[in-house]
């Protein structure tokens, strides 16, 4: 079974200090709910510098089907992968042989997920089994985050420059994966 990519585009975002990006269209719906006033998550302040415009972070969009065992989503989902190392734009490596932008003792900014969203999927299963309703966790936005020596480096492994080349059969996630996350396989590589 081949996996079909419908869309694969990269958008470079240059967040501003204190800006809280608008939710993606998938977050909009007409459900009637008891919403809490000002109940959304607070804006992050990802940078500790005045020259915010020099920092950038890329959001790569991939549209694909997701699978759970023998079952496959009825429709593809569009997910976002955070890519790149955040640094002064003029110093970001863009040619072979360019060195990294930061000093050994300087702060390390990384492009990592900022917020997550849920999307409903209907999984179609073979053998006449009833469709399964599930909700998948997708990255809603990326941010440049300043790392300190207290950060667990393992949580960043999926979100460095390697994130631009998503791994086969795995959904990039920070920290440990749940047992169920390990079952969430993609049908093929990008």
């Amino acid at each position: 079974q081949g996996w079909q990519a419908f869309k694969n585009d990269a958008t470079e975002i240059i967040p501003e200090l204190g800006e809280y990006p608008e939710p993606p269209p998938e977050l909009e719906n007409n459900k009637t709910m008891n919403r809490a006033e000002n109940g959304g998550r607070p804006p992050h302040h990802p940078f500790e510098t005045k020259d915010v415009s020099e920092y950038s972070c890329r959001e790569l969009h991939f549209t694909r089907y997701v699978t759970d065992g023998p079952c496959r989503s009825a429709k593809p989902v569009t997910e976002l992968v955070c890519s790149g190392q955040c640094g002064p734009a003029r110093l970001l490596p863009n040619a072979i042989g360019r060195g990294k932008w930061w000093r050994p003792s300087g702060p390390d900014f990384r492009c990592i997920p900022d917020r997550y969203r849920a999307q409903r999927v209907q999984l179609l299963c073979p053998g006449g089994e009833a469709p399964r309703a599930r909700k998948v966790r997708l990255v809603a936005s990326c941010k440049c985050k300043r790392l300190t020596r207290f950060h667990n480096q393992s949580e960043l492994k999926d979100f460095g420059t390697e994130a631009a080349r998503p791994q086969k059969g795995r959904k990039p996630r920070p920290r440990a994966r749940s047992a169920k996350a390990n079952q969430a396989e993609l049908e093929n590589a990008y």
Epitope: P23, T32, R35, G40, A133, K135, V136, A181
Partner: antibody, heavy 121, light 109 residues
Amino acid sequence: EVQLVQSGAEVKKPGASVKVSCKVSGYTLSELSMHWVRQAPGKGLEWMGGFDPEVGELIYAQKFQGRVTMTEDTSTDTAYMELSSLRSEDTAVYYCATDAGGFWYKFFQHWGPGTLVTVSS
Amino acid sequence: QAVVTQEPSLTVSPGGTVTLTCGSSTGAVTSGHYPYWFQQKPGQAPRTLISDTNDKHSWTPARFSGSLLGGKAALTLSGAQPEDEAEYYCLLFYGGTVVFGGGTKLTVL
């Protein structure tokens, strides 16, 4: 693995407010969907509200609208639930519960130990 | 607001099979209600057994299974053990709102 630690037991007078905290470790709070559930002595579970990742907002059960405030401090990975205008029937164990952080959303997978709130004059 | 109904109490013999059900006042329960099942023993926090109709967790014993049965969510226990004696709660999603059932006290006797 997600772990939840809640604040200690509280004794309050009718009309007062109580604020219960729930500290997350193992994941960051912004990755998770935190909910609050209470259980009166000898009674069943009652959902109070929580973070709905489909709309990106905290939502409350209609019964508690106007009386409950849920907040999340992502800098300390701590969630708070404040209930005001307490009555004797609010005496209950208050639980925080969250999903496991996997690719598939599995809500209420990890539970805090509970915080007993006693409302008595 | 919707009301979620469960049998108040059920009894099963050790090694026997029992099915707990979870109904909705709004009509048939579907997979779109994402039925959850919890087990709670006295003095303990609830523990999730089943998510999204039939998904077991790593700690869920194989003798528990979830399904949809006659317009209700169902939790079937096959080969009951003494340690399965507990209160069982179901939960249904209605849009963004969540409603718990009243609970079923299961006795293994």
